[in-house]
């Protein structure tokens, strides 16, 4: 599912509980993101050593996976609301190209392959309706797009499965900042 | 398995500045979720957060100190270091380093140091 | 600043007793709650995230539960190394704020 079902299974229950607002909406969603990472991070590194591997920095300067930095204003130090939002969905979307490569990458978690990949979908829309500034977002390319994926799917068994891992570390540091930086909005 | 240990002087003058290290093992900021904070207590009295740093180099300040606080690390030594300045007799107090490790960063300090005790 | 409040500020006991802590957050923390006992001389040790997650290791005596803005400590059957200081901390919003403990005597 899309969207997490419930109370996340480790909340607390409460009883007549206010519907949630567009905040924790969020803030549960980017953790349900988070768990589905977790799964497939674990089936990632009980199937390789990748999780181990020193060569990661070999195969990092292929990948331009997005990540914070101070000038993106997610940070305590010039933080900025609305430049941060433009950073979060723009690196949402720019996820999404690698996303897609992870779907045919898993044996027993494809479902839950889906799932993070719809997710963030679901996720993209919420700060979507959360951003004032809609024409600052710029989406990747399509044809470009297209390319990199049938470059990353030509690679070697060793390389695919380091982009695997190095994709799930990378989303799942992007999320946490991102969930850092909303909190504080 | 996880530990953090202070270290610094034990006696400050007044006006002087505090510079506190956190060496720590177990862990390190390569660990997305990963922060190191400070928090005080002075003798017979409640806790105090003062200062956090993150895996990724972000930090956070007590509002009420933060013209007076300053925190680094050093990923390579593993340690995390806090100073601060213009200390007076009411800023004694132990102080301690603590970690927080959680995918969905809740900030609950799993592991402390043993303190230090500034006077 | 979220201001946390614990109430009693010191509790008599014996072992065996049922024994409840109570804090109250001064604004809205969702499940952001942890609660921590400290030993005199020894640092703090943190039992229960998340309002009621317990840490690993910690006795299943121990647990805690929430009602809005109000949180709940409990300890069911005391034991003698449960006296101590037990300390609420909301870790919501920055700066992250701690209670003023209370004594378990």
């Known amino acids: 599912a899309p969207v997490p079902p419930g109370e996340d299974s480790k909340d607390v229950a409460a009883p007549h509980r206010q519907p949630l607002t567009s905040s924790e909406r969020i803030d549960k969603q980017i953790r349900y993101i988070l768990d589905g990472i977790s799964a497939l991070r674990k089936e990632t590194c009980n199937k390789s050593n990748m999780c181990e591997s020193s060569k990661e920095a070999l195969a990092e300067n292929n990948l331009n996976l997005p990540k914070m930095a101070e000038k993106d204003g997610c940070f305590q130090s010039g933080f900025n609301e609305e430049t941060c939002l433009v950073k979060i969905i723009t690196g949402l979307l720019e996820f999404e190209v690698y996303l897609e490569y992870l779907q045919n990458r898993f044996e027993s978690s494809e479902e839950q392959a889906r799932a993070v990949q719809m997710s963030t979908k679901v996720l993209i829309q919420f700060l979507q309706k959360k951003a004032k500034n809609l024409d600052a977002i710029t989406t990747p390319d399509p044809t470009t797009n297209a390319s990199l994926l049938t470059k990353l799917q030509a690679q070697n068994q060793w390389l695919q499965d380091m982009t695997t891992h190095l994709i799930l570390r990378s989303f799942k540091e992007f999320l946490q900042s991102s969930l850092r930086a909303l909190r504080q909005m | 398995q996880v530990t953090l240990k202070e270290s610094g002087p034990t006696l400050v003058k007044p006006t002087q500045t505090l510079t506190l290290t956190c060496i720590f093992s177990g862990f390190s900021f390569k660990t997305s979720g990963v922060s190191v904070g400070w928090i005080r207590q002075p003798p017979g009295k409640a806790l105090e957060w003062l200062a956090l740093?993150?895996?990724?180099?972000?930090?956070r300040y007590s509002p009420s100190l933060k013209n007076r606080l300053t925190i680094t690390r050093d990923t390579s030594k593993n340690q995390v270091v806090l100073t601060m300045t213009n200390m007076d007799p009411v800023d004694t107090a132990t102080y301690y380093c603590?970690?927080?490790?959680?995918?969905?960063?809740?900030?609950?300090?799993?592991?402390w140091g043993q303190g230090t005790l500034v006077t | 600043d979220v201001v946390m409040t614990q109430s009693p500020s010191s509790v008599s006991a014996s072992v065996g007793d049922r024994v409840t802590i109570t804090c109250r957050a001064s604004q809205d923390i969702d499940n952001f709650l942890a609660w921590y006992q400290q030993k005199p001389g020894k640092a703090p040790n943190l039992l229960i995230y998340?309002?009621?997650s317990l840490r690993s290791g910690v006795p299943s005596r121990f647990s805690g539960s929430r009602s809005g803005t109000d949180f709940t400590l409990t300890i069911t059957s005391l034991q003698p190394e449960d006296f101590a200081t037990y300390f609420c901390?909301?870790?919501?919003?920055?700066?992250?704020?701690f209670g003023p403990g209370t004594k378990l005597e």
């Open positions: 603590a970690r927080s490790y959680d995918d969905y960063l809740y900030y609950a300090l799993d592991y």
């Open positions: 901390q909301q870790t919501r919003r920055f700066p992250l704020t």
């Open positions: 998340k309002v009621s």
């Open positions: 740093i993150y895996w990724d180099d972000d930090k």
